[in-house]
Amino acid sequence: AVNGTSQFTCFYNSRANISCVWSQDGALQDTSCQVHAWPDRRRWNQTCELLPVSQASWACNLILGAPDSQKLTTVDIVTLRVLCREGVRWRVMAIQDFKPFENLRLMAPISLQVVHVETHRCNISWEISQASHYFERHLEFEARTLSPGHTWEEAPLLTLKQKQEWICLETLTPDTQYEFQVRVKPLQGEFTTWSPWSQPLAFRTKPAALGKDT
């Protein structure tokens, strides 16, 4: 929802967290603001305190329940409001009717590990965290490998167009240090976006055997 120079953007992690960012030019830094969530079909409501992340933007996480509990469904709509204190009352600064499964951003994949490493290839696996039962197998992944002397931005993206929680990296250089990251995205949702990148996994390929062609 955008009001003039105000922007209010939220994402649902598909289980029990809605993360919101509110930005407004010229907003007072010392004003106390919060996000309030009212689902249309549920018995709970939730509030979180907006904390500054830059000069004109604030963020907070609505914790809806235990991390792996499914708190919203594909038919739910949540009214999200930014409320800021003005003297003794609260003023509504922004409002949106939020469809959780149209605005998904999952948690970064976790538990990255090297399953098998050779001189030229490496098999890596990972797990998804706090992902809804609704997705079944309807997820995709992007992966990238950091080579020596390059930046993450330069790393080519490898796309896995299915729920495949492993990858076999080929054509690697022997006895070389690499780093690997992966991110996940559900196929569902008009405004769904990629998860953050996972924590990097460092690994080293095996040295080439002496006397062998590399």
């Epitope: 549920r42 469904t73 594909t74 038919v75």
Partner: antibody
Framework: QVQLVQSGAEVKKPGASVKVSCKAS????????ITWVRQAPGQRLEWMGD????????NYNEKFQGRVTITVDTSASTAYMELSSLRSEDTAVYYC?????????WGQGTLVTVSS | DIQMTQSPSSLSASVGDRVTITCRAS??????LNWYQQKPEGTLKLLIY???GLHSGVPSRFSGSGSGTDFTLTISSLQPEDVATYYC?????????FGQGTKLEIK
């Protein structure tokens, strides 16, 4: 206290339409979904559709193939369910209910009999 | 559509007995499972919401448990006024669907 009061029993001929009303009181009508459920004799409960009075948004069970229309009159805090092209198998008790993490309050039910 | 299957279809128990009714969903519905009581005259009441939440005014002898596809309604000590038909219902997705019901009688 929350109350949902439905209109009285109806007898209709095949091919006709029926419109059942559900008057809500004891809560803010525009803030909760109203759902319609029916129960044919000796059968399980069957969800027909729902409406959010605050916006007029509706959802329908595809089984009813466009025969059902759910509306509200917010000024009267009343929801309506209209079922058209009636057939004998539509003979059932029709219930309205409020949705709030389950259907937490129900109307008393309206018996609709379809008979030639 | 998600199919809901209850068992048993009917049961007879004595006052004071512990009674268990089960409900199985044809696919994972997380915890979006509710239980209703329908008295012989047709009156419907919500007993349990979101698998285990006790609706206001419902006696504490009623409880619910389960997750995913398998769910249970338990009456810890059966009372004469519990004679009714009990229905499970999923609100995981539209169209919402109900079990076929379990008719409970007193011996």
């Amino acid at each position: 206290q929350v109350q949902l009061v439905q209109s009285g029993a109806e007898v209709k001929k095949p091919g006709a339409s029926v419109k059942v009303s559900c008057k809500a009181s004891g809560y803010t009508f525009t803030s909760h979904w109203i759902t319609w459920v029916r129960q044919a004799p000796g059968q399980r409960l069957e969800w027909m559709g729902d409406i959010y009075p605050g916006s007029g948004n509706t959802n329908y069970n595809e089984k009813f193939q466009g025969r059902v229309t759910i509306t509200v009159d917010t000024s009267a805090s009343t929801a309506y369910m209209e079922l058209s092209s009636l057939r004998s198998e539509d003979t059932a008790v029709y219930y309205c209910a409020r949705e709030r993490g389950g259907f937490d309050y129900w109307g008393q039910g309206t018996l609709v009999t379809v008979s030639s | 559509d998600i199919q809901m299957t209850q068992s048993p279809s009917s049961l007879s128990a004595s006052v004071g007995d512990r009674v268990t009714i089960t409900c199985r969903a044809s696919q994972d519905i997380s915890n979006f499972l509710n239980w209703y009581q329908q008295k012989p005259e047709g009156t419907l009441k919500l007993l349990i919401y979101y698998t285990s939440g006790l609706h206001s005014g419902v006696p504490s002898r009623f409880s619910g448990s389960g997750s995913g596809t398998d769910f249970t309604l338990t009456i810890s000590s059966l009372q004469p006024e519990d004679v009714a038909t009990y229905y499970c219902q999923q609100d995981n997705n539209h169209p919402y669907t109900f079990g076929q019901g379990t008719k409970l009688e007193i011996k």
